[in-house]
């Protein structure tokens, strides 16, 4: 059976204060079944950024309905960036389970916030 | 504000068990991976443990098979279980919120565990 | 693991003077290097990280610089509330996190 892939498209995205961002993931496979989250960094120390779940994530919503049977966008939208969300972004798949088992990150994509036009 | 309280330091005898807890506020908990820091008096600091955002669990090498880090979402509450409990972890313990950088940009005021016979 | 060695181990320096002291780590780490500031009986208050980047509330007198195995924090004008233990860490290779074993800044 054909590896599933995790496909983050943009390598970098530019956006400018105060608007909103929209960071990109399909996956290629509905197999195996699991949850995706979005985290920013990498290792120990990455923070959540969004889990349909479970969580608080007042500033972001999901492009797609995620909960739509057969659903392979799990593209996200955070509303109103600051200068502080810049930074890698990743889209990750995990295998259901308890706990849930990490299978396959994209590659990430950059966030850069460029200063609001005056 | 973000705020870190740790609690449940004290004296125990080598070979005893301790717990300690760390309060967390101010933030969302379960969006950041935590950690504890420790520093034995007069000394400089020593990581210790951290738990991830999806309860993956890391050790220092002195620790390892001793203690046990864990979280409670919920409660917006991290642990430290410490058993088998030597002289050389007298300490003072830190908990601390990580960063996406994976650097501790917010503290507690430290519990204190005292390791003597 | 990588080991972090600053020097020097205490600085005396007078209120108003610069202060520059450093931090070698054993393999590369790129520009992933954090400063922390520890007054007695405090915690530790994270300064600086990715070698040059204030973190937040942090005054503008504190500076960092190098990259790849050697570093530096400055204090372009030491306050009165600057005399503290300087602590570097790295954040590249984990686990487990590093730190050095601290500079000492003490009024001359």
């Known amino acids: 059976e054909e590896e599933l892939q995790v496909i983050q498209p943009e390598k970098s995205v530019s956006v400018a204060a105060g608007d909103s961002a929209t960071l990109n993931c399909t996956v290629s496979s509905l197999i195996p079944v699991g949850p995706i989250q979005w985290f920013r960094g990498a290792g120990p120390g990455r923070e959540l950024i969004y889990n349909l779940k479970e969580g608080h994530f007042p500033r972001v919503t999901a492009v797609s309905d995620p909960t739509k049977r057969n659903n392979m966008d799990f593209s996200i939208r955070i509303s109103n960036i600051t200068p502080a969300d810049a930074g890698t972004y990743y889209c990750v798949k995990f295998r259901k389970g308890s706990p849930d088992v990490e299978l396959k990150s994209g590659a990430g994509t950059e966030l850069s916030v460029r200063a609001k036009p005056s | 504000d973000v705020q870190l309280v740790e609690s449940g330091g004290g004296l125990v005898r080598p070979g005893e068990s301790l717990r300690l807890s760390c309060a967390a506020s101010?933030?969302?908990?379960?969006?950041?991976?935590v950690t504890w820091v420790r520093q034995a008096p007069g000394e400089g600091l020593e990581w210790v443990s951290l738990i991830s955002v999806t309860g993956t669990t890391y050790y220092a090498d002195s620790v390892k098979g001793r203690f046990t880090i864990s979280r409670d979402n919920s409660k917006s509450t991290l642990y430290l279980q410490m058993n088998g409990l030597r002289a050389e972890d007298t300490a003072v313990y830190y908990c601390a919120k990580v960063t996406w950088k994976n650097v501790f940009d917010y503290w507690g005021l430290g519990t204190l565990v005292t390791v003597s016979s | 693991e990588i080991v972090l060695t600053q020097s020097p181990g205490t600085l005396s320096v007078s209120p108003g003077e610069r202060a520059t002291f450093s931090c070698r780590a054993s393999?590369?780490?790129?520009?992933?290097l954090a400063w922390y500031q520890q007054k007695p009986g405090q915690a530790p208050r994270l300064l600086i990280y990715d070698a040059n980047t204030r973190a937040t509330g942090i005054p503008a007198r504190f500076s960092g610089s190098g990259s790849g195995t050697e570093f530096t924090l400055t204090i372009s004008s030491l306050q009165s509330e600057d005399f503290a233990v300087y602590y570097c860490q790295q954040h590249t290779d984990w686990p487990p996190y590093t730190f050095g074993g601290g500079t000492k800044v003490e009024i001359k």
């Open positions: 393999q590369t780490v790129g520009s992933k």
């Open positions: 101010g933030f969302t908990f379960t969006n950041y991976a």
